[in-house]
């Protein structure tokens, strides 16, 4: 007997062919001999089966000697042996309907687990193989689990169900809810405006939740909440903000924060958390602020950085168009009795300048000018 695999919710066409290429009488029945449909002349007639409103045929094919049974919106319980009676002969087709669903929402937070559950008819013994968007293969029986979802797991998962050497393919769209970057670092000169951006790695029609930015300043003994906000249908509204610093927040996505001035006392690390409605757990993004200050006090030219810098970063002081006078893997460098001219303080990583501050040193009888 012919085996046909179907997907839950899909439409399937079971074929039945007569040797005569013309419209003749046919009937489709189920294994309990209950009539599903047939014809009376050119009219389609239906029997008392549970498929009544979901069964159909195509009149245009009858003249070709084809008498299909089309079942719409397939259910697992439609799995059965269907019998086509035409020209005093019987054709049997075994239909097996499978369903594959994500047992939770298909929108999952980064780090959460995905479980795919296969619904299958009694007596079947299918195998399932799924391929993630990043090409990772997982195999299983009735359930497949993937722990610690990563951002690259967002996209279409393609799962193949194998039964009786036949296969049916499912596509499940998974959205991993996360920020585009786990961590970011902003380098600023003292006094400059600071922009923090927290772009999301996903798009959904309606996004509702609440968030908070906690800040651990390098100079402070404990962290403090800088801002709390609500998100309703992608609209941002500030709930509470500290007086120092007085952050400003954009009203639209992506989440955007502005610090009016970069000051040494603000240098440090922040953690923005976003709790989404109807989701357990939170999204996190770390943000770091490094602040640079170049000063001249009497005969001492000093350059300092505050904030989370890597030990491999180089801090240098150099007179414009000259070799660096001082260059160290430290957070402060200085030059005694600096020559007059435009001095540059540079924070660099393997030769790439991350931050630069210029200070003009005047001849000794003058006071320094900061551009």
């Amino acid at each position: 007997k012919k085996v046909v695999l179907g997907k839950k919710g899909d439409t399937v066409e079971l074929t039945c062919t007569a040797s005569q290429k013309k419209s003749i009488q046919f009937h489709w029945k189920n294994s309990n001999q209950i009539k599903i449909l047939g014809n009376q002349g050119s009219f389609l007639t239906k029997g008392p089966s549970k498929l009544n409103d979901r069964a159909d045929s195509r009149r245009s094919l009858w003249d070709q000697g084809n008498f299909p049974l089309i079942i719409k919106n397939l259910k697992i319980e439609d799995s059965d042996t269907y019998i086509c009676e035409v020209e005093d002969q019987k054709e049997e087709v075994q239909l097996l309907v499978f369903g594959l669903t994500a047992n939770s929402d298909t929108h999952l937070l980064q780090g959460q687990s995905l479980t795919l559950t296969l619904e299958s008819p009694p007596g079947s013994s299918p195998s399932v193989q799924c391929r993630s968007p990043r090409g990772k293969n997982i195999q299983g029986g009735k359930t497949l689990s993937v722990s610690q979802l990563e951002l690259q797991d967002s996209g279409t998962w393609t799962c193949t169900v194998l039964q009786n050497q036949k296969k049916v393919e499912f596509k499940i769209d998974i959205v991993v809810l996360a920020f585009q970057k786990a961590s970011s670092i902003v380098y600023k000169k003292e006094g400059e405006q600071v922009e923090f951006s927290f772009p999301l790695a996903f798009t959904v029609e309606k996004l509702t939740g609440s968030g908070e930015l906690w800040w651990q300043a390098e100079r402070a003994s404990s962290s403090k909440s800088w801002i709390t906000f609500d998100l309703k249908n992608k609209e941002v509204s500030v709930k509470r903000v500290t007086q120092d610093p007085k952050l400003q927040m954009g009203k639209k996505l992506p989440l955007h924060l502005t610090l009016p001035q970069a000051l040494p006392q603000y240098a440090g690390s922040g953690n923005l958390t976003l709790a989404l409605e109807a989701k357990t757990g939170k999204l996190h993004q770390e943000v770091n602020l490094v602040v640079m200050r170049a000063t001249q006090l009497q005969k001492n030219l000093t350059c300092e950085v505050w904030g989370p810098t890597s030990p491999k970063l180089m801090l240098s002081l150099k007179l414009e168009n000259k070799e660096a006078k001082v260059s160290k893997r430290e957070k402060a460098v200085w030059v005694l009795n600096p020559e007059a001219g435009m001095w540059q303080c540079l924070l660099s990583d393997s030769g790439q300048v991350l931050l630069e501050s210029n200070i003009k040193v005047l001849p000794t009888w003058s006071t320094p000018v900061q551009p």
Epitope: G6, K7, G9, D10, T11, V12, E13, G41, S42, F43, L44, D56, R58, R59, S60, D63, I70, I71, K72
Partner: antibody
Framework: QVQLQQWGAGLLKPSETLSLTCDVY????????WTWIRQPPGKGLEWIGE???????NSNPSLKSRVTISVDTSKSQFSLRLSSVTAADTAVYFC?????????WGQGTLVTVSS | DIQMTQSPSSVSASVGDRVTITCRAS??????LAWYQQKPGKAPQLLIY???SLLGGVPSRFSGSGSGADFTLTISSLHPEDFATYYC?????????FGQGTKLEIK
């Protein structure tokens, strides 16, 4: 809900080949026939032909020698090629899903054949 | 090929009127007939299938009847959005064919 979105070249010269593709979003790709219908400006509807997910085709005898309908189930899309076009092939071309009746329809693509 | 002939080819009516459009097949097509509505610049939309079954979401003022070779589409009380062109289509045999259309215009 099933949605059909079609695309392809809108301006052709006589003797060229018309090529249109229809993307199917949502719903079942199997079990239905995927159809092309055209409508010359200010005129009625003409059935061109159809294909199912396994590649079985039926087409209008009046166009059969020039029509090729193909399907790519992995992309949930089907395509129409009409060779040796003339000005008489100028029409809005629609893709649609069929199970005896046509529903839903693509947005339509105006194809103009002009030298 | 089965020829489908619609009449009238155009009809003028007012909001609230009852309108009937007929469709005749050149041979018996049982009840393998559908009705579509098309507005300018848009794709046709299925209204009625199997001669008399109303598609879900279509207002109940639309109804279809007939069997064999003669069919009718009735709009019981015209609404402003009903002014459009209507087509019948047979699904009895290949090639599928349509009527030439009936344009329903505001009087």
């Amino acid at each position: 809900q099933v949605q059909l979105q079609q695309w392809g070249a809108g301006l052709l010269k006589p003797s060229e080949t018309l090529s249109l593709t229809c993307d199917v979003y949502g719903g079942s790709f199997s079990g239905y026939y995927w159809t092309w219908i055209r409508q010359p400006p200010g005129k009625g509807l003409e059935w061109i032909g159809e294909i199912n997910h396994s590649g079985t085709t039926n087409s209008n005898p009046s166009l059969k020698s020039r029509v090729t309908i193909s399907v790519d189930t992995s992309k949930s899309q089907f395509s129409l090629r009409l060779s040796s076009v003339t000005a008489a092939d100028t029409a809005v071309y629609f893709c649609t899903r069929e199970l005896n009746w046509f529903d839903p329809w693509g947005q339509g693509t105006l194809v103009t054949v002009s030298s | 090929d089965i020829q489908m002939t619609q009449s009238p080819s155009s009809v003028s009516a007012s909001v609230g009127d009852r309108v009937t459009i007929t469709c005749r097949a050149s041979q018996d097509i049982a009840n393998w007939l559908a009705w579509y509505q098309q507005k300018p610049g848009k794709a046709p939309q299925l209204l009625i299938y199997a001669a008399s079954s109303l598609l879900g979401g279509v207002p109940s003022r639309f109804s279809g009847s007939g069997s064999g070779a003669d069919f009718t589409l009735t709009i019981s009380s015209l609404h402003p959005e009903d002014f459009a062109t209507y087509y019948c289509q047979q699904a009895n045999s290949f090639p599928y064919t349509f009527g030439q259309g009936t344009k329903l215009e505001i009087k």
